[in-house]
């Protein structure tokens, strides 16, 4: 699902207040609900009829440093006999998410939000038929 | 997929530098890759063998203000005849994501990261069998 453009109004002070100096604002340390955890059924990437693999990307100047991307294993879906059925299609499910980018020059450290497109998993769909002239 | 605990080291300055004053840091305005967009196949939530509905939650003091949650429509999966097959199961695919929480008292505005659990869609799996004594 998509994240709307900021329009930067979200990060501005009310009009009646003095503007934010130097185009930056105060970000409090700590993360709300940091201990919240995904509670998905186990190994769904292998048990799915549209199975997927995971690739981990790592960047020490990004939070979270580890971002996991899914890739569908097949074009088709796996049927009850364990064979690929290409009358159906495995398609990626994508999600826009935010990460924090760390920028530093010596002791001057600043942070900026960054939008990242994450493929979270795959689902099996009936393909849309397009009649080409 | 899960976001690791910060341990808050990511947001700290190098040891040789003076500490961050007042437990906050500088967040630059603007979002990197803001124009990046999800490019999923259309209507996959209805075309999937594990279809889902969307619910939108709205919070003006959160960025993004709109967070969309998926809910699987069925316990089973939809077969080629359009009937629910409950020998298979529709399961949610979850993702931990970051949002920004805005806190303000008068003209004093600060921001804090918050972890949110988002159900992005559903996939069809073979259920794991547990023998109960």
């Amino acid at each position: 699902r998509k994240i709307p453009k900021v329009g930067h109004t979200f990060f501005q002070k009310p009009e009646s207040c003095p503007p934010v100096p130097g185009g930056s604002m105060k970000l409090d340390i700590g993360i709300i609900n940091e201990n919240q955890r995904v509670s998905m059924s186990r190994n769904i990437e292998s048990r799915s009829t549209s199975p997927w693999n995971y690739t981990v990307t790592w960047d020490p100047n990004r939070y979270p440093s580890e971002v996991v991307q899914a890739q569908c294993r097949n074009l088709g879906c796996i049927n009850a006999q364990g064979k690929e059925d290409i009358s159906m299609n495995s398609v990626p499910i994508q999600q826009e998410t935010l990460v924090v980018r760390r920028k530093h020059q010596g002791c001057s450290v600043s942070f900026q939000l960054e939008k990242v497109l994450v493929t979270v998993g795959c689902t099996c769909v009936t393909p849309v038929i397009h009649h080409v002239q | 997929r899960k976001i690791p605990k910060v341990g808050h080291t990511f947001f700290q300055k190098p040891e040789s530098c003076p500490p961050v004053p007042g437990g906050s840091m500088k967040l630059d305005i603007g979002i990197i890759n803001e124009n990046q967009r999800v490019s999923m196949s259309r209507n996959i939530e209805s075309r999937s063998t594990s279809p889902w509905n969307y619910t939108v939650t709205w919070d003006p003091n959160r960025y993004p203000s709109e967070v969309v949650q998926a809910q699987c429509r069925n316990l089973g999966c939809i077969n080629a005849q359009g009937k629910e097959d409950i020998s298979m199961n529709s399961v949610p695919i979850q993702q931990e994501t970051l949002v920004v929480r805005r806190k303000h008292q008068g003209c004093s505005v600060s921001f804090q990261l918050e972890k949110v659990l988002v159900t992005v869609g559903c996939t069809c799996v073979t259920p794991v069998i547990h023998h109960v004594q």
Epitope: R47 | L75, P92, P127, H130
Partner: nanobody, 116 residues
């Protein structure tokens, strides 16, 4: 943790009736179902009947339609399988099951034998 307690079963003649019962306790979500699978040694497990715990929708194998009826008593999460006009091919071990999305919990099994 899910617990299943099943009862019923036994020996019956062709054309006779039996009733199986099963109760479930533990963590039960709104999107779940209860029912029975059966298995004949050396053959694949077969879904016999299921009932959705909140919607009440029922599902039957084609081989038992119009002969078997699944019902649920909401108050104590108990289900019953009324089996009428039994045939020798219904002979199997019947397993009570509770299905949470992605996880199928199976009871200890009860033998049903239909003699000709």
């Amino acid at each position: 943790q899910v617990q299943l307690v099943q009862s019923g079963g036994g020996l019956v003649q062709t054309g006779g009736s039996l009733r199986l019962s099963c109760s479930v306790s533990g963590d039960i979500s709104s999107q779940s179902a209860m029912g029975w699978y059966r298995q004949v040694p050396g053959r694949q497990r077969e879904l016999v009947a299921m009932i959705h715990t909140t919607k009440g929708d029922t599902y039957y194998a084609d081989s038992v339609k119009d002969r078997f009826t699944i019902s649920r008593i909401n108050a104590n999460n108990t289900i019953h399988l009324q089996m009428n006009n039994l045939k020798p091919e219904d002979t199997a071990i019947y397993y009570c099951t509770h299905n949470e999305p992605g996880d199928l919990y199976m009871g200890q099994g009860t033998q049903v034998t239909v003699s000709s």
